[in-house]
């Protein structure tokens, strides 16, 4: 014959566990019914009667199957540089997340405490590791052969135009500008890659290869002036 | 927090060189250039160059260009200033700052270090 | 290169008082120029970047403001621990610190 099925209360053999969904009460040292998510208990179960459970008050939740006494409290509502990923309910808590151009600069157990404006690169700066949903933006030098002439969390380096006969020389903020009306090759945007290690400008670093994808306009000409963004400033 | 802390005074002779180190702690090291700044006593700020320790590029002021080196090493997270052939006019509190390459330039500084040059 | 001429050199000035410093570029720089306040025997620190943005922890006291190639660093209310030595430097071609305002005490 199979074993009778324990109605809750009841009190557990010794040694064994309570069930699923139930936990040991120590005052009454019976087995009881934890309550849903959703609800709290509003009554401990007794050696004769069991817990008895009731919906959280709005803006309070339990997640799990339990047996407090109270609902958790829902956290406060998002910050202006935030939006509301998951709303609060009785069973789950509110979660908050970085706006579109912020990232999580200090985060809690869900979503995000604190919230910060994802870095721009000036002129003459490129993005060389994109912001995350809990990183920053990176920025580097642009690289000789490459510029970027913008203020911002996006925009990489991109290669000077190549020209059939140059106007100004491009530098790191600054395009090349040809006086041709078009430029003999221009390197396609897709074809762009972060900015990567490359001899200095003045010469006091071991030189290594300018990235494929970049190429210098030096080998058409000399190089142009020293970059806006990153210049020379001497008398 | 974000600190930068220099080298300690020197005092040099003419022709001879200095090195000046600048080790940063309390955030990312090679997320920055690191800006070297000098000030003569009495006198005003004078930019010297920058460093990006990620890959050792550098940019230098042309009056600077013959006679300084900026290295970095980021085991150490430090940066490095060595000026050569030094003069007496090379008499200066030499600064490290940081920069992110954002509109916000050099938020952090060194104390400074103190390099005099006298025979 | 940009030349950046501040003015005045110096400053004479009381406690409430409001006070403004000038720069001027020698040519166009954008936005990118900043304000430091040194005291003597320490390091500059950032005031104001970007010409108009407040470094964290600065007070309110300080502003910035540009027309055209003149960026202005205003003082709206001194207080004691704002005489000290104030430097502009523009960072968008190259990299040039002006000349410097030395803020005394009348």
């Known amino acids: 014959l199979p074993a009778q099925v324990a109605f809750t209360p009841y009190a557990p053999e010794p040694g064994s566990t309570c069930r699923l969904r139930e936990y040991y009460d120590q005052t009454a040292q019976m087995c009881c019914s934890k309550c849903s998510p959703g609800q709290h208990a509003k009554v401990f179960c007794t050696k004769t009667s069991d817990t008895v459970c009731d919906s959280c008050e709005d803006s309070t939740y339990t997640q799990l199957w339990n047996w407090v006494p109270e609902c958790l409290s829902c956290g406060s509502r998002c910050s202006s540089d935030q939006v509301e990923t998951q709303a609060c309910t009785r069973e789950q808590n509110r979660i908050c997340t970085c706006r579109p151009g912020w990232y999580c600069a200090l985060s809690k157990q869900e979503g995000c405490r604190l919230c910060a404006p994802l870095r721009k690169c000036r002129p003459g700066f490129g993005v060389a590791r994109p912001g995350t949903e809990t990183s920053d933006v990176v920025c580097k030098p642009c690289a000789p052969g490459t510029f970027s002439n913008t203020t911002s969390s996006t925009d990489i380096c991109r290669p000077h135009q190549i020209c059939n006969v140059v106007a100004i020389p491009g530098n790191a903020s600054m395009d090349a500008v040809c006086t041709s009306t078009s430029p003999t090759r221009s390197m396609a945007p897709g074809a762009v890659h972060l900015p990567q290690p490359v001899s200095t400008r003045s010469q006091h670093t071991q030189p290594t290869p300018e990235p494929s994808t970049a190429p210098s306009t030096s080998f058409l000409l000399p190089m142009g002036p020293s970059p806006p963004a990153e210049g020379s400033t001497g008398d | 927090q974000v600190q930068l802390v220099q080298s300690g005074a020197e005092v040099k002779k003419p022709g001879a060189s200095v090195k000046v180190s600048c080790k940063a702690s309390g955030y990312t090291f090679t997320d920055y250039i690191i800006h070297w700044v000098r000030q003569a006593p009495g006198q005003g700020l004078e930019w010297m160059g920058w460093?990006?320790?990620?890959?050792?590029?550098?940019d230098y002021a042309d009056k600077f260009k013959k006679r300084v080196t900026m290295t970095a090493d980021t085991s150490i997270s430090t940066a490095f200033m060595e000026l050569s052939r030094l003069r007496s006019d090379d008499t200066a509190v030499y600064y490290c700052?940081?920069?992110?390459?954002?509109?916000?330039?050099?938020?952090?500084w060194g104390q400074g270090t103190l390099v005099t040059v006298s025979s | 290169d940009i030349q950046m001429t501040q003015s005045p050199s110096s400053l004479s000035a009381s406690v409430g008082d409001r006070v403004t410093i000038t720069c001027q570029g020698s040519q166009n720089i954008d936005n990118y120029l900043a304000w430091f306040q040194q005291k003597p025997g320490k390091a500059p620190k950032l005031l104001i970047y970007s010409t108009y943005s407040l470094q964290t922890g600065v007070p309110s006291r300080f502003s910035g403001s540009r027309s055209g190639t003149d960026f202005t660093l205003t003082i709206s209310s001194l207080q004691p621990e704002d005489f000290a030595t104030y430097f502009c430097?523009?960072?968008?071609?190259?990299?040039?610190f002006g000349g410097g305002t030395k803020l005394e005490l009348k």
């Open positions: 430097f523009q960072y968008n071609q190259g990299y040039m």
């Open positions: 700052a940081r920069d992110d390459a954002s509109p916000l330039v050099m938020d952090a």
């Open positions: 460093i990006d320790p990620d890959y050792g590029n550098t």
